[in-house]
């Protein structure tokens, strides 16, 4: 296993809808032709897998069916999408790249992205 | 870029089928290939996918336990293998290169009868 | 899964017609791509990541759309597009596909 860089957002706030948008960009040592991008939430020192990816020539990430992230590739960058925050899923939010084929295999995990995640406040009851 | 897949194929119910994909004219490495069923008169289904390189797979799960898809790097093939074959299984089998779909063999008739 | 339901199902045009095909998603998805098919041969892919068109399509083919809702319009029909053209999606697996538009002539 060799280690690879990563490097992603230091911050991100989410929209009012709940989604956040960042980038995940790699320093691939060769010509990777098959990627494998997993996105980890760390939050009270615990880690858990938010969603993944295995992805090939194409420019579409393609996730499992209740997955909450979209994303798309270009390049050494993958720009992920996550929806369906609350304020209860602010944490760090960190990118791990696999270059899975050909050999050898790399590994590379970034800092984290801080998500910020307001729920936006209920509208107040309209006399009109 | 060019892809060929074996010939026709008549089964019982409840036998098994392997149906290859021999690609060629580009890196077989490089990119998923899709397997993706067309019964007769009917849309097109995708049953899964396999990276050759690694052998990584996803499966459409109303295929799961019944279908296992393979690939062979060292003559550039792919296999997908159903089992517990029904009559609804009598479709026309395609295998197809990439994210992109982007070519297809003409495709394998599997024809599930008794 | 996502469901891709195509419209009109079924389509009778005259050449030289403009014709539009919809899409519409159950979920919002990234992209969407659009196959032709005609009888008795493979699909053929037309368009990917929702307007690039497919080496050798010709421009009187075009895709649009977002989210939940896409088109795949021919400006002028020719007596080879009649066909079979489905939708696909590729955001979440299982990759699907809507149940296709036939296209025929008038």
């Known amino acids: 296993c060799k280690a690879m860089h990563v490097a992603q957002p230091a911050v991100v706030l989410a929209s009012s809808r709940g989604i956040a948008s960042f980038v995940c960009e790699y320093a691939s040592p060769g010509k990777a032709t098959e990627v494998r991008v997993t996105v980890l939430r760390q939050a009270d020192s615990q880690v858990t897998e938010v969603c993944a990816a295995t992805y090939m020539m194409g420019n579409e990430l393609t996730f499992l069916d209740d997955s909450i992230c979209t994303g798309t590739s270009s390049g050494n960058q993958v720009n992920l999408t996550i929806q369906g925050l609350r304020a209860m899923d602010t944490g760090l939010y960190i990118c791990k790249v696999e270059l899975m084929y050909p050999p050898p295999y790399y590994l590379g995990i970034g800092n984290g992205t801080q998500i910020y995640v307001i729920d936006p406040e209920p509208c107040p009851d309209s006399d009109f | 870029v060019q892809l060929v897949q074996s010939g026709a194929e008549v089964v019982k119910p409840g036998a098994s089928v392997k149906v290859s994909c021999k690609a060629s004219g580009y890196t077989f490495t490089s990119y998923w290939i899709n397997w993706i069923r067309q019964a007769p008169g009917q849309g097109l289904e995708w049953i899964g996918r396999i990276a050759p390189g690694s052998g990584t797979t996803y499966y459409n799960e109303m295929f799961t336990g019944r279908v296992t898809l393979t690939r062979d790097t060292s003559t550039s093939t792919a296999y997908m293998e159903l089992s517990s074959l029904r009559s609804e299984d009598t479709a026309v089998y395609y295998c197809?290169?990439?994210?992109?779909?982007?070519?297809w063999d003409q495709g394998t008739m599997v024809t599930v009868s008794s | 899964d996502i469901q891709l339901t195509q419209s009109p199902s079924f389509l009778s045009a005259s050449v030289g017609d403009r014709v539009t095909i919809t899409c519409s998603a159950s979920?919002?998805?990234?992209?969407i791509h659009w196959f032709q098919q005609k009888p008795g041969k493979a699909p053929k892919l037309l368009i990917y990541d929702t307007s690039t068109l497919a080496s050798g399509v010709p421009s009187r083919f075009s895709g649009s759309g977002s989210g939940t809702e896409y088109t795949l319009t021919i400006s002028s029909l020719q007596p080879e597009d009649f066909a079979t053209y489905y939708c696909q999606q590729r955001t979440t697996y299982p990759l699907t596909f809507g149940q296709g538009t036939k296209l025929e002539i008038k």
């Open positions: 197809a290169r990439g994210d992109y779909f982007d070519y």
């Open positions: 979920k919002s998805v990234s992209y």
